[in-house]
């Protein structure tokens, strides 16, 4: 799996999980968020030739169509595959909020 | 939705789905599949700007932090969302087999 | 990489008030929070507030109400922290300490505030 | 706010010995919880974040786990060198209180 167990234990230019911390405040603009100031969300990058952890048949197509015909824009792009949700701290006027944002953190990639 | 009736009569930079017909032998060097001789497979290309058919609340994250940061390379791309079968005739000796190749034709795109 | 210095050691009346401050390099300063930590004598520690040089954001122990007052300048990249009406209680070394990632991960190497009449 | 009850108050082992330290919330702080290593007349030093990460340069017998309102502190192979007051901390809505130390 092209999760942080492989990933961030090997240099890596194919489709892989990248580290990528986000600051609410600072990256996104958001002020409203209390806790926490920031997260691990993660992101995905990097080349998908062709059978790297292909999604499905058309992706498995396109990166031997793209092997075949480098010179095409068709290719397939290195995307997140397992999500997790992040436990938020949030306040309306004095009283505080606790919300799970769904999707929120990337645990593993795929090529799609 | 990012789709054939919306992409392919709209000139449109960003996320969008792209014709793109295979021809079996040419482009993927098959040779096994008698007919089709070839197929409207298409593919998801363009940019994937803030809210722009985000998929999850991280492709959310992910493109107004880049809206933010625009130097970074934490983006997410543009990919297939809505994929159909494609129905295939091929020989096993002199015996046809017909078959379904699921997922080989994108029919809209998303960006993740 | 990241550097916290802060100011010497003060001497202080009870009832009087200290300024301290904490220069930050190697990072930017405007998009991180900066936490104020104290610990006392052979005791832990207690957490005092935050300020966001960004905007001036803060958030405060409501222990400290009226007396803690967290400032950042962001022309030289220094926060201060001022405590008023100070007592034998508040000695103690005072720390700045940049928060990142659910934690602090750098440290000012402390200040030590001595109260005595 | 939130109170961090950490445990034992202080423990004696030998080189190569596993140690335990425990922190408990007094409500659920989720992952949000911080270690720190001080040596006397030392700066802390920060060891585990958000509850199981590894600080840059903190060597790997130290790890952190737990989630919730029960976290723990593990040094897996003891040495000299870890002799020191270590504190729990959480980072879940302000005041961030810290354990008494172990």
């Known amino acids: 799996a092209l999760d942080a167990a492989y990933c961030f234990r090997n240099v890596q230019d194919n489709c892989c999980l990248r580290p990528l911390y986000i600051d609410f405040k600072r990256d996104l603009g958001w002020k409203w968020i209390h806790e926490p100031k920031g997260y691990n969300a993660n992101f995905c990058a990097g080349a998908c030739p062709y059978l790297w952890s292909s999604d499905t048949q058309h992706s498995r197509v396109l990166s031997l169509y793209n092997t075949i015909n480098p010179e095409a824009s068709a290719s397939p792009c290195c995307v997140s595959q397992d999500l997790e949700p992040l436990t938020i701290l949030y306040y309306i006027g004095k009283t505080p909020k606790i919300e799970q944002l769904s999707n929120m953190i990337v645990k593993s990639c795929k090529c799609s | 939705a990012l789709d054939a009736a919306y992409c392919f009569r709209n000139v449109q930079d960003n996320c969008c789905l792209r014709p793109l017909y295979i021809d079996f032998k040419r482009d993927l060097g098959w040779k096994w599949i008698h007919e089709p001789k070839g197929y409207n497979a298409n593919f998801c290309a363009g940019a994937c700007p803030y809210l722009w058919s985000s998929d999850t609340q991280h492709s959310r994250v992910l493109s107004l932090y880049n809206t933010i940061n625009p130097e970074a390379s934490a983006s997410p791309c543009c990919v297939s969302q809505d994929l159909e079968p494609l129905t295939i005739l091929y020989y096993i000796g002199k015996t046809p087999k017909i078959e379904q190749l699921s997922n080989m034709i994108v029919k809209s795109c998303k960006c993740s | 990489q990241v550097l916290l210095v802060q100011s010497g050691a003060e001497v202080r009346k009870p009832e009087a008030s200290v300024k301290i401050f904490c220069k930050a390099s190697?990072?930017?300063?405007?998009?991180?929070?900066m936490n104020w930590v104290r610990q006392a004598p052979a005791q832990g520690f207690e957490w005092m507030g935050q300020?966001?040089?960004?905007?001036?954001?803060?958030n405060y122990n409501g222990k400290f109400k009226g007396r803690l007052t967290l400032t950042a300048d962001t022309s030289t990249n220094t926060a201060y922290m001022e405590l008023s009406s100070l007592r034998s209680t508040d000695m103690a070394v005072y720390y700045c300490?940049?928060?990142?990632?659910?934690?602090?991960?750098?440290w000012g190497q402390g200040a030590l505030v001595t109260v005595s009449s | 706010e939130i109170q961090m009850t950490q445990s034992p108050s202080s423990l004696s082992a030998s080189p190569g010995d596993r140690v335990t330290i425990t922190c408990r919330a007094s409500?659920?702080?989720?992952?949000?919880l911080a270690w720190y290593q001080q040596k006397p007349g030392k700066v802390p030093k920060l060891l585990i974040y958000?509850?199981?990460n590894l600080a840059d340069g903190v060597p790997s017998r130290f790890s952190g786990s737990g989630s919730g309102t029960d976290f723990t502190l593990t040094i897996s192979s003891l040495e000299p060198e870890d002799a020191a007051t270590y504190y729990c901390?959480?980072?879940?809505?302000?005041?961030?209180?810290f354990g008494g130390g172990t």
């Open positions: 901390q959480h980072f879940w809505g302000t005041p961030y209180t």
């Open positions: 300020i966001y040089p960004g905007d001036g954001d803060t």
């Open positions: 190697g990072y930017s300063f405007t998009s991180s929070w």
């Open positions: 300490a940049r928060h990142y990632d659910g934690s602090t991960d750098y």
């Open positions: 958000a509850a199981t």
């Open positions: 409500e659920n702080i989720y992952s949000n």
